[in-house]
């Protein structure tokens, strides 16, 4: 029934104080996306993008999280505490729920490599 696949930016690294784009993409399904949830490693919700209501950024992250591009999320003013797992959850009809995982490593180094390849988790 669930024919789709989630592609994500996979394992990425970014510099402390910088910004990073978290991106997921759902493909290979006819299902309609009604909502996308973005969660942090401790399962706290960062943001929700509802098809009808648009974006809602949770208050604790309002200053450092920007919606987009697309259904993705931009994290700004990165700190070392931002290191960890991030999850995108796609709620779709009639397939159900698809979930993607991204691991972000925030580096002290001024020469942090920022890799953003797409991969299937």
């Amino acid at each position: 029934m669930m024919t789709g696949t989630i592609e994500t930016t996979g394992n990425i690294s970014a510099k402390k104080g910088g910004s990073v784009i978290l991106q997921c993409h759902l493909s290979s399904t006819m299902a309609q996306v009604t909502q996308v949830n973005w969660e942090q490693h401790d399962h706290s919700l960062l943001a929700i993008r509802n098809a009808e209501l648009g974006w809602h950024i949770y208050p604790a992250f309002k200053d450092r999280v920007a919606p987009g591009p697309g259904l993705g999320l931009t994290l700004q003013s990165l700190t070392m505490n931002d290191t960890g797992e991030y999850f995108c959850t796609y709620h779709t009809y009639p397939d159900g729920t698809y979930r993607g995982r991204i691991f972000l490593e925030v580096l002290e180094s001024s020469v942090a490599e920022h890799s953003a390849r797409f991969q299937i988790p």
């Epitope: 006819m30 309609q32 009604t34 098809a51 009808e52 709620h91 009639p94 729920t97």
Partner: antibody, heavy 122, light 106 residues
Framework: EIQLVQSGSELKKPGASVKVSCKAS????????MNWVRQAPGQGLEWMGW????????TNAQGFTGRFVFSLDTSVSTAYLQISSLKAEDTAVYYC???????????????WGQGTMVTVSS | DIQLTQSPSFLSASVGDRVTITCRAS??????LAWYQQKPGKAPKLLIY???TLQSGVPSRFSGSGSGTEFTLTISSLQPEDFATYYC????????FGGGTKLEIK
């Protein structure tokens, strides 16, 4: 007010075609999937299929392929059901129904059209 | 396809009665179940979704329970306007409806 308003009753001869419309108002049409449900006289509800209102991709349920076509005109927030080569057994009330809920367990058909009676008789 | 079997098909009851309708799924559907009420000549109306969540505006005498393969719709105290046909629907995969339960006045 959120509502779905369907076109009026139709009387058709066998072999003819019919196109039923379902006009949405009070919400963003492209944000919610649309379903079609058939109810033959004195019978229960049968899910016919659905259309992705964002992409226009239709999906037909088993038993409703070939002669049954779902389409959209997003500019007027309207979904359509076209049935070709009508048969007497197509006589039924046809409903459009929106999928409400953000996702997960919350999905359900929260808004229904009033129904369109299609009678096929020679 | 997932089949839903409703029981009973017909139910006679009186105003004030407590009634229970059962819906059994041919395989586990977690809580992906909704209940609808339909009156003659009218479109179905959503009563309950997610097996037990009451739709906005629906009286609290209606309640739903269950998970997996067995679900129930309960009306705690029947009112005259409750005499109608009730359908369960699964949304775990492509939707299907139960055969319906016609609730009649005794």
């Amino acid at each position: 007010e959120i509502q779905l308003v369907q076109s009026g009753s139709e009387l058709k001869k066998p072999g003819a075609s019919v196109k039923v419309s379902c006009k949405a108002s009070g919400y963003t049409f492209t944000s919610y999937p649309m379903n079609w449900v058939r109810q033959a006289p004195g019978q229960g509800l049968e899910w016919m299929g659905w259309i992705n209102t964002n992409t226009g991709n239709p999906t037909n349920a088993q038993g409703f392929t070939g002669r049954f076509v779902f389409s959209l005109d997003t500019s007027v927030s309207t979904a359509y059901l076209q049935i070709s080569s009508l048969k007497a057994e197509d006589t039924a009330v046809y409903y459009c129904a929106r999928v409400g809920g953000y996702g997960g367990y919350d999905y359900a058909f929260d808004i229904w059209g009033q129904g369109t009676m299609v009678t096929v008789s020679s | 396809d997932i089949q839903l079997t409703q029981s009973p098909s017909f139910l006679s009851a009186s105003v004030g009665d407590r009634v229970t309708i059962t819906c059994r799924a041919s395989q586990g559907i977690s809580s992906y179940l909704a209940w609808y009420q339909q009156k003659p000549g009218k479109a179905p109306k959503l009563l309950i979704y997610a097996a037990s969540t009451l739709q906005s505006g629906v009286p609290s005498r209606f309640s739903g329970s269950g998970s997996g393969t067995e679900f129930t719709l309960t009306i705690s105290s029947l009112q005259p306007e409750d005499f109608a046909t009730y359908y369960c629907q699964q949304l775990n995969s492509y939707p299907t409806f139960g055969g319906g339960t016609k609730l009649e006045i005794k």
